[in-house]
């Protein structure tokens, strides 16, 4: 094994080129200068290096930059990025959106890896907030990115960034996340007129309070059932039958198909059967006529 440590005569790499794919691992180790590799990183991605060969190249860069790679190298890592561990990435200081895009491109079409998650975390923390350009970039590569953040992390999203959010970006968000995003969206879209406003705010409504739903019911918005089913149950329960009818418009007929599911089921239980009958949909389970409804929660609050 000793003789393998020296680079064979005539094999010393003068540049990073395709001839290196024919080098054995030990030859790459012995014949490629780390400084040369660092200055010609942009060529690595153009050459079909194998998994094992990339391991050797990474080892060379690690020796050259034990404290972490400079951004000039990081930007050109290409497929070598896939060899990095989250620990490696935590040593980096990535400030350029172009660098972030270049590395996300490497993993495009594949689910978010721990490396990518660490990279994004480092980048966003470095910027201090999730600005519009960053959010645009992240959701373009990972539509579910926003919903992978905790409510605490989402609180750092400025309202101006909400313009970058597409409906599909919110598909996997839970109510706690929408509770944080909805007020930001309301603020971001506040200067839009009725119908345009509703189109933009619709995907965020899973975080809307009762009073906002009541206000929307006065604006002929014709909310579809899919949106209605994603509303917070506690926000839907206080709505009257008339308000729900106005909110849904022609889509109100869809309530019948959803009468066994939340929030429709719970809402029906809170309505007078007389009022439900006015919809003519055959909804059953409301409060029978003549019964008195006591709000025990209100009583407890008073006592």
């Amino acid at each position: 094994e000793v003789e393998k440590t020296a680079c064979p005569s005539g094999k010393k790499a003068r540049e990073i080129d395709e001839s290196l794919i024919f080098y054995k691992k030990w030859e790459l180790e012995a014949c490629v200068d780390a400084a040369l590799l660092a200055t010609q990183m942009d060529r690595v991605n153009a050459i079909p290096f194998t998994y094992e060969q990339l391991d050797v190249l990474k080892h060379k860069l690690d020796e050259l930059y034990p404290q972490g790679y400079p951004e000039s190298v990081i930007q050109h890592l290409g497929y070598l990025f896939l060899k990095m561990s989250p620990e490696d990435i935590r040593k980096w200081n990535v400030t350029s959106l172009e660098t972030l895009k270049a590395l996300l491109e490497v993993n495009k079409g594949h689910e978010m890896s721990p490396q990518v998650a660490t990279l994004i975390d480092r980048f966003v923390k470095g910027r201090g907030q999730l600005d519009k350009d960053t959010l645009d970039t992240l959701t373009a590569f990972y539509p579910g990115y926003l919903c992978s953040l905790s409510p605490e992390e989402l609180s750092s999203v400025p309202p101006s960034s909400i313009w970058a959010v597409r409906p599909q970006d919110l598909d996997t968000c839970d109510p706690r996340q929408l509770d944080v995003l909805y007020p930001k969206a309301r603020l971001a879209f506040q200067n839009m007129n009725g119908s345009e406003y509703f189109v933009k705010i619709q995907s965020f409504l899973g975080g809307a309070p009762t009073e906002d739903l009541k206000a929307l019911s006065q604006q002929n918005v014709s909310m579809d059932l899919a949106t209605f089913m994603k509303l917070r149950t506690d926000a839907v329960l206080p709505l009257t039958v008339a308000e729900v009818q106005k909110l849904l418009g022609p889509h109100v007929e869809g309530l019948k198909a959803e009468e066994r599911h939340r929030p429709v089921r719970d809402w029906i239980l809170r309505q007078r059967q007389d009022d439900l009958d006015t919809l003519g949909l055959g909804l059953q389970g409301g409060i029978p006529n003549g019964y008195l409804v006591l709000d025990l929660s209100m009583q407890e609050a008073l006592s």
Partner: nanobody, 114 residues
């Protein structure tokens, strides 16, 4: 990323074969790609490669006999093999980009020269 190699078979010495490698996604058009082969009991070795810029390179043992090419529209890489020799007998694989970096390989296509 899925890689499906085809075109292998049994051929006499001096004969020709054209191997194809169909890839899902846009792997072929945007990435450097290469053909590799693995003979029984041997390690997998590169045979021919094409950089993302389109330049080609060949192992000394196949220079002048093999040609690598690609069709971006069909997302397919080819290996034209002429003047085949018994020592070219192996399972041939193509790879590139993400799958190569992640060490994901297709099933390969078997070539026997006898």
């Amino acid at each position: 990323v899925q890689l499906v190699e085809s075109g292998g078979g049994l051929v006499q010495p001096g004969g020709s074969l054209r191997l194809s490698c169909a890839a899902s996604g846009s792997m072929v058009s945007i990435n450097a790609v290469a053909w590799y082969r693995q003979a029984p009991g041997e390690q997998r070795e590169p045979v021919a490669a094409m950089t993302s810029g389109g330049s080609t390179i060949y192992a000394d043992s196949v220079k002048g006999r093999f040609t690598i090419s690609r069709d971006n529209a069909k997302n397919t890489v080819y290996l034209q093999m002429n003047s085949l020799k018994p020592e070219d007998t192996a399972v041939y694989y193509c790879n590139g980009g993400w799958s190569l970096a992640m060490d994901y390989w297709g099933q390969g296509t078997s070539v026997t020269v006898s």
